[in-house]
Interface confidence: medium
């Protein structure tokens, strides 16, 4: 028997520095977790203790903090090189700055193979990107061979900016021939490493003949065997065992997100490459693990540029940006309109001639808007200003909801109106009218939504049975502020870009902004 240790991360999302327990900015260092310096300490400790170790990343290193905003992926290549990752799969967020924003900072600079078998380049891009990412890589580990085959969510064109010269194929269809090719090369230990979410990971384990282990990402799935060490609730045991169609037991793993845990899986193979046993658990990277001083020093060196960036002007406002609680928790506020407009603008994807865009709607809990911005400071807007407005380090995500769920959400928005509670929704691509004289749960008297399958966008009444795409904060997608109906009834959820980054990019693009209060939210006469 031959034993392999797989160390794995996924959905790190730019958390190069240690974070608080909820993966936001570290405040009390003695209670902070994760970060590349701490990860390196643990990885090296395991490399020293065990003979056959692979360090793998299942995608979405890009996007999530000011680190990515400023360094645009150069930080990912630099620190993944320093940690000596063995391979990485492309995630959807790796395309957030377009293909060029992937090629230059990461693909050309990484000293480890970057993989995806189901992304096919065409046209002029094919020669430009040739060899910079691979469908698979055979790695020497000790005296054995391990094949790593990559995959990426086929939804990426709707979630990011891969352009028109990359085709995202069905994962299973694309993986099978690559695995077959590895078998012909006498590679009998094969890991599928990819970024399509836990459901697809399980399908790959079930359907792709010859895959021995699946290491996934995208769905931020936390798996654990035994008593979990922090706040995350396990979605199943680690590893999650899938019985393949040809009767093999295939371990499937994921390691939550944000670099909070290091996935640790031990696999035992027989001489024919069959998995005999698999066991392990994610390792919580808490403060009991010291940060490596060399990596930490490097982090501090790179940090200097971030501090300078946060005070630079992104753009100007010529109007007061009203992000006050008195406004945003009670009525339409222009800060809410600005943020929602930025959220929609960030999700412009012309992927189908029948649609002007794939999504037109935004909802945003008023309680998530934490500060106004005064235009009387020469109109200047900085990252620092926006961090005061959106201090929680969340993301603006894409969900699919039925009209009936949206109606419930808007009823919840005003079910206890008047108490300055955070659930009052700011909107984009939606016209809502409330009648507060009616009883809670029946206060939405009009709800019109902007069409997407149209050449000239216009507002149509919401249809209860239709499925709609909506951009919203991850906080709402996870049922925050009492929006349990969203969490329980959403049909699809894909995590998006860092909230501040979305707004800052929009402001930089517009240069001068002047959002108005324009009648997106109305109250029927006599009720307000």
């Amino acid at each position: 028997a031959w034993e392999l240790t797989i160390l794995h991360t996924n959905d790190v999302h730019s958390r190069l520095e240690q974070t608080s327990e909820d993966s936001s900015k570290c405040v009390n260092a003695s209670r902070c977790m994760g970060g590349v310096a701490r990860l390196f300490t643990k990885v090296q400790q395991i490399r020293r203790a065990e003979p056959n170790v692979l360090l793998l990343d299942a995608g979405d290193q890009y996007q999530g903090t000011i680190w990515f905003t400023v360094y645009k992926g150069a930080e990912v290549a630099h620190f993944m090189n320093a940690l000596r990752y063995d391979a990485m799969a492309l995630g959807n967020h790796e395309f957030d700055n377009g293909v060029e924003g992937l090629i230059e900072p990461l693909l050309k600079e990484a000293k480890f193979p970057i993989l995806s078998a189901n992304i096919k380049a065409k046209g002029p891009l094919a020669s430009q990107i040739s060899g910079l990412y691979l469908p698979y890589k055979v790695l020497p580990v000790g005296d054995e061979v391990v094949g790593i085959v990559g995959y990426t969510s086929k939804e990426t064109p709707f979630l990011s900016n891969p352009g028109t010269n990359l085709v995202f194929e069905d994962e299973i269809t694309a993986l099978q021939p690559e695995v077959d090719k590895l078998k012909t090369l006498n590679v009998n230990k094969i890991i599928a490493l990819g970024h399509s979410g836990f459901e697809m990971d399980k399908l790959i384990a079930q359907k792709v003949r010859g895959v021995d282990v699946v290491v996934g990402g995208h769905s931020n799935t936390f798996l654990y065997t035994g008593n979990p060490p922090s706040k995350e609730v396990p979605a199943g045991k680690y590893p999650f065992i899938v019985t393949s169609d040809d009767g093999r037991k295939v371990p499937v793993v994921q390691a939550y997100a944000f670099g909070k845990y290091l996935g640790y899986l031990k696999i035992e193979f027989d001489e024919r490459g069959n998995v005999i046993s698999s066991h392990g658990n994610p390792i919580l990277l808490n403060s009991s693990i010291p940060e490596d001083p060399s990596i930490k020093a490097d982090i501090n060196k790179w940090r200097i540029k971030l501090d300078n960036y946060s005070t630079q002007e992104l753009g100007k406002t010529i109007v007061y940006l009203d992000g006050s609680s008195q406004s945003c928790r009670f009525r339409e506020c222009n800060m809410g309109n600005l943020i929602c407009d930025a959220m929609i603008n960030n999700n412009l994807r012309h992927t189908d001639e029948m649609f002007w865009n794939h999504v037109s709607m935004c909802i945003l809990n008023g309680g998530g808007i934490r500060s106004p911005i005064d235009e009387r400071n020469n109109g200047t807007i900085t990252w620092e200003n926006l961090a005061a407005v959106l201090p929680f380090g969340g993301t603006f995500d894409l969900v699919q909801l039925k009209g009936s769920t949206l109606k419930k959400a808007f009823e919840h928005s005003v079910h206890r109106y008047g108490q300055s509670t955070g659930e009052f929704l700011q909107v984009g691509g939606i016209h809502v009218v409330y009648d507060l004289s009616r009883k809670p749960g029946d206060r939405v008297v009009k709800l019109d939504v902007l069409c997407t399958k149209c050449r000239v966008p216009s507002y149509d009444p919401l249809k209860m049975d239709e499925v709609y795409k909506v951009i919203l904060p991850n906080f709402l997608a996870n049922g925050g502020d009492g929006f349990q109906m969203i969490k329980d009834e959403l049909l699809r959820h894909d995590s998006g870009d860092q909230d501040i980054n979305v707004v800052s990019t929009y402001i930089s693009k517009m240069k001068v902004i002047y959002p108005a209060v324009e009648g997106r939210i109305k109250f029927s006469t006599g009720s307000h």
């Epitope: 090296q44 090189n81 000596r84 063995d86 391979a87 990484a110 480890f112 005296d143 490596d292 060399s294």
Partner: antibody, heavy 121, light 107 residues
Framework: QVQLVQSGAEVKKPGASVKLSCKAS????????INWVRQATGQGLEWIGW????????KYNEKFKGRATLTVDTSISTAYMELSSLRSEDTAVYYC??????????????WGQGTTVTVSS | DIQMTQSPSSLSASVGDRVTITCRAS??????LAWYQQKPGKAPKLLLY???TLASGVPSRFSGSGSGTDYTLTISSLQPEDFATYYC?????????FGGGTELEIK
């Protein structure tokens, strides 16, 4: 430009130890492995081991384990190789070489000029 | 340990000749193979890696091929500066061994 500069020639007696240095410049020292390779006169090349300067992680050729010790001083971007219990067959030119990549593309892309070690009684 | 056997051990050729040097590994090294050129009194110089990728600044007359256990270095048209000793090296399982070398001399 990127270069590795090695210390001068050494003459040692059998049983003694020798410590060779390799000073790097023109690149980030902590980002690349430093390997050591030797070549006896008129002979081929023999790999001794490598060290990752960022944290001193080492890997040795079993043949040299226990006799060769690889270390670094990152403050002066210098790698060292100490070889103990010298015998006459250790007489050779010793090279340090930078290794590119990790498990991606592997090769020695930059070499030092070599240090001649002579072991003689 | 994987042994690397180079052939021939020495070779005489003329300027303009096409020359082929082979390297056989005792086990599959999966293209993790580099070729170096060494001149007397000098350190080796990288020519190719991954069996066939030309290193930066190396003339295109040098090329590599092969897979599994058998690899070849070809010089399409010998130039005066190409007379030297050539070594292959595998980067599979440690120790990373070198071939015995091929001395290329002027005929």
């Amino acid at each position: 430009q990127v270069q590795l500069v090695q210390s001068g020639a050494e003459v040692k007696k059998p049983g003694a130890s020798v410590k060779l240095s390799c000073k790097a410049s023109g690149y980030t020292f902590t980002s690349y492995d430093i390997n050591w390779v030797r070549q006896a006169t008129g002979q081929g090349l023999e790999w001794i081991g490598w060290i990752y300067p960022r944290d001193g992680f080492t890997k040795y050729n079993e043949k040299f384990k226990g006799r060769a010790t690889l270390t670094v001083d990152t403050s002066i971007s210098t790698a060292y190789m100490e070889l103990s219990s010298l015998r006459s067959e250790d007489t050779a030119v010793y090279y340090c070489a930078r290794k590119e990549g990790y498990r991606g593309d592997w090769y020695f892309d930059v070499w030092g000029q070599g240090t001649t070690v002579t072991v003689s009684s | 340990d994987i042994q690397m056997t180079q052939s021939p051990s020495s070779l005489s050729a003329s300027v303009g000749d096409r020359v082929t040097i082979t390297c056989r590994a005792s086990g599959n090294v999966h293209n993790y193979l580099a070729w170096y050129q060494q001149k007397p009194g000098k350190a080796p110089k990288l020519l190719l890696y991954n069996a066939k990728t030309l290193a930066s600044g190396v003339p295109s007359r040098f090329s590599g091929s092969g897979s599994g256990t058998d690899y070849t270095l070809t010089i399409s048209s010998l130039q005066p500066e190409d007379f030297a000793t050539y070594y292959c090296q595998h980067f599979w399982s440690t120790p990373w061994t070198f071939g015995g070398g091929t001395e290329l001399e002027i005929k």
